[in-house]
Amino acid sequence: ITRQSLDPQRRAAPQQKRSSPTEGLCPPGHHISEDSRECISCKYGQDYSTHWNDFLFCLRCTKCDSGEVEVNSCTTTRNTVCQCEEGTFREEDSPEICRKCRTGCPRGMVKVKDCTPWSDIECVHKES
C-alpha cells in the first residue's frame, strides 16, 4: 500500500496519549493514526500491540473462554494469557479447547507424569 494528508468514526479519545511515528512506525502499545502523523496509545485492558507497527488500530485483547483461567491480564503491550483449568489440558492438535485429563492409566501401566494445563497424564508399561 502506498501513501500519497483519518476518521471521526474512529478518533482517539482525549485521554489516549499521542506521539510521532519513527520511520513510519509506532512503538509497542500504540497504533498509527490514519494520516500517518501520530502514534495513539492502545486502551489498557481492551487492546494491545506487541511490536513496532503501522496498524490503524490496536489488536483486541483475548477473553478467556469458560474452562480457562486468566494467568496474565491484557496490557497495552501484551495479550491476555489464558490457561486450561485444573484437570484439563490443551492439545497441540486442537488448541482451541481444553480437554479433560485422564483420571488414571490403563491396566498394566503406571503414571509417570501428572496432568498439566499443557499435557495429559503420561503412562508407561509396568516393568515385569
Epitope: 500500500i1 501513501r3 483519518l6 490503524l56
Partner: antibody
Framework: QSVEESGGRLVTPGTPLTLTCTVS????????MSWVRQAPGKGLEWIGI?????TTYYASWAKGRFTISKTSTTVDLKVTSPTTEDTATYFC??????????????WGPGTLVTVSS | ALVMTQTPSSVSAAVGGTVTINCQAS??????LAWFQQKPGQPPKLLIY???KLASGVPSRFSGSGSGTEFTLTISDLECDDAATYYC????????????FGGGTEVVVK
C-alpha cells in the same frame, strides 16, 4: 444512504479519464472510501482508499496509475494513462469502521470503462 | 505485496449441503478479513467482517473462522440463492498493507 459511480465510457489508450462516485445520505468527512475494479469475467481488484480527512493510499500496483481525490459529496478516481488492461467495471465502496476492523459495506452499482483503440 | 490465495476456484454442492471456502494470506493479517458474495451484474455484498462477524441482515448459515494467515468461510444448509462467487479480502488495517482480494470461488448449487 447510497453511492453511485459515473463517468465510465469508451476511451482510447493514453487518454486520461476521471470517474466520479457521488454519495448521498452520509458525510464523506465521516467515512473512508475505496475504489475497486473488476475486469470482464475476472475477480475483484482493490485500487486504493481515501480517508475521511483526505489521506490517500494505493495498492502497490496502482501507484502512479491512479489518483483519488474528493469534494464534500463526491470521490473521484483519475485513470492517468489508461491501457487496454484497465478495461473493467469500477466500483466505489464506503468503508465502515467496526471498532477493530474496517469493511466495505456499501457499494455502488459500478461504471464500465472500456479502453480500446 | 500481500497476496490472498483462495481455494477452491469452484465448488458444487446440493441444496441443504455445506460448502467450505479457504483463504490464505501471504503474511499475518490477524483478524482483518472480510468475505463478500457477488452475483452476475451486481456489486459485491459484504457477508462477514473481522473474520467471523456477520454483517447486518446476513443469515447465520454463513460463518467465518481463522486468524493470522488461514481463514475459512462455511455456508451450511445451502440454498439455491447462495449460488454466487465469493471473495475474501484483507480489510484495511495497516498503512503498508494492500487490501488485496482473493481470486474468488464460484459456488454452484445443485
Amino acid at each position: 444512504q447510497s453511492v453511485e459511480e459515473s463517468g465510465g465510457r469508451l476511451v482510447t489508450p493514453g487518454t486520461p479519464l476521471t470517474l466520479t462516485c457521488t454519495v448521498s445520505g452520509f458525510s464523506l468527512s465521516n467515512y473512508a472510501m475505496s475504489w475497486v475494479r473488476q475486469a470482464p469475467g475476472k475477480g475483484l481488484e482493490w485500487i486504493g482508499i481515501i480517508s475521511s480527512s483526505g489521506t490517500t493510499y494505493y495498492a502497490s500496483w496502482a501507484k502512479g496509475r491512479f489518483t483519488i481525490s474528493k469534494t464534500s459529496t463526491t470521490v473521484d478516481l483519475k485513470v492517468t494513462s489508461p491501457t487496454t488492461e484497465d478495461t473493467a467495471t469500477y466500483f466505489c465502496a464506503r468503508e465502515t469502521y467496526y471498532g477493530y476492523s474496517y469493511a466495505a459495506g456499501l457499494w455502488g452499482p459500478g461504471t464500465l470503462v472500456t479502453v480500446s483503440s | 505485496a500481500l497476496v490472498m490465495t483462495q481455494t477452491p476456484s469452484s465448488v458444487s454442492a446440493a441444496v441443504g449441503g455445506t460448502v467450505t471456502i479457504n483463504c490464505q494470506a501471504s503474511q499475518n493479517i490477524y483478524s482483518n478479513l472480510a468475505w463478500f458474495q457477488q452475483k452476475p451484474g451486481q456489486p459485491p455484498k459484504l457477508l462477514i467482517y473481522e473474520t467471523s462477524k456477520l454483517a447486518s441482515g446476513v443469515p447465520s448459515r454463513f460463518s467465518g473462522s481463522g486468524s493470522g494467515t488461514e481463514f475459512t468461510l462455511t455456508i451450511s444448509d445451502l440454498e439455491c440463492d447462495d449460488a454466487a462467487t465469493y471473495y475474501c479480502q484483507s480489510s484495511w488495517h495497516s498503512i503498508s498493507t494492500d487490501c488485496a482480494f482473493g481470486g474468488g470461488t464460484e459456488v454452484v448449487v445443485k
